[in-house]
């Protein structure tokens, strides 16, 4: 079974800068899985942001404009990254990655 680790406990960024979060997949080939990213804002329910499937197809949350969240995966390091562009106060949240084994 696959295991996920998010090595960064926290990330502090200046407004308008870029934040890059990592999710390390072990126990399964990342190219054979779909990785999902979610966020939980204080006092709110968890929300789907973006996913990348085994074939590299990306799907985003309909209500968030393109260009805000960018997901990728690096097979060499078995890592998925979530890049948050133009960081704003409303991006303050806890971000989770999840795995769907194909």
């Amino acid at each position: 079974a696959g295991h996920l680790e998010q090595p960064q406990i926290s990330s502090t960024k200046t407004l308008s800068k870029t934040a890059r979060l990592e999710c390390v997949v072990s126990g399964i080939t990342i190219s054979a899985t779909s990785v999902y990213w979610y966020r939980e804002r204080p006092g709110e329910v968890i929300q789907f942001l973006v996913s990348i499937s085994y074939d590299g197809t990306v799907r985003k949350e309909s209500g968030i404009p393109s260009g805000k969240f960018e997901v990728d995966r690096i097979p060499e390091t078995s890592t998925s990254t979530l890049t948050i562009h133009n960081v704003e106060k409303q991006d303050i949240a806890t971000y989770y990655c999840a795995l769907w084994e194909v």
């Epitope: 985003k60 309909s62 404009p65 393109s66 260009g67 960018e70 997901v71 990728d72 409303q90």
Partner: antibody, heavy 118, light 108 residues
């Protein structure tokens, strides 16, 4: 059937203002991010602005930042672009487009022509 | 800002021929964030390809997209009369979203 219909274009003098509208139908408008893209006569496409479903995320091209304001009214299934301090280089056909969940803009309106000239 | 450069500017081909259109990015773009559009005179653009190899709804399989990093290609395997148009690439991985300058595919 998904439909996007722009209106509000016309002839305006440099320094003037104009408000474009985009009426959406055939889908749940309140769920989707929306965009404005323009095309100057005989030229290519230029992204202008985008807005999230709840208006929380808003982005602008540098060329219009501080002059244009994007907004939406989910109750009226409408997208807007308030254009102030218009310049000759803003002359273009303005299209509204829906953000596709899987990338790109999957539906576009027919466009509305904005001409800025004295 | 990611600048996309399309080449050639104009491609003169006959129906039935293969068309190969190039889109080069000024910095690396994830292949998952590149799209192609077709635009005919007096019409709005139409989404053809996203991601960069997924065909949009109702797009025939003669259209295909490939590429990674900074180099992307749209291929039309056999040109049909209705394929003569202008084609644009777009990156949507980061704001500002940007389009290439376009390639016009015209009848030879």
């Amino acid at each position: 059937e998904v439909q996007l219909v722009e209106s509000g274009g016309g002839l305006v003098k440099p320094g003037g203002s104009l408000r474009l509208s985009c009426a959406a139908s055939g889908f749940t408008f309140s769920v989707y991010s929306m965009n404005w893209v323009r095309q100057a006569p005989g030229k290519g496409l230029e992204w202008v602005s985008s807005i999230g479903s709840s208006s929380s995320y808003i982005f602008y091209a540098d060329s219009v930042k501080g002059r244009f304001t994007i907004s939406r009214d989910n109750a009226k299934n409408s997208l807007y672009l308030q254009m102030n301090s218009l310049r000759a280089e803003d002359t273009a056909v303005y299209y509204c487009g829906r953000d596709h969940d899987y990338g790109g803009l999957d539906y576009w309106g027919q466009g509305t022509l904005v001409t800025v000239s004295s | 800002e990611i600048v996309l450069t399309q080449s050639p500017g104009t491609l003169s081909l006959s129906p039935g021929e293969r068309a190969t259109l190039s889109c080069r990015a000024s910095q690396s773009v994830s292949s998952s964030y590149l799209a192609w559009y077709q635009q005919k005179p007096g019409q709005a653009p139409r989404l053809l390809i996203y991601g960069p190899s997924n065909r949009a709804t109702d797009i025939p399989d003669r259209f295909s997209g490939t590429g990674s990093g900074t180099d992307f290609t749209l291929t039309i395997s056999r040109l049909e009369p209705e394929d003569f148009a202008v084609y644009y690439c777009q990156q949507y991985g980061r704001s500002p979203l940007t389009f290439g300058g376009g390639t016009k595919v015209e009848i030879k």
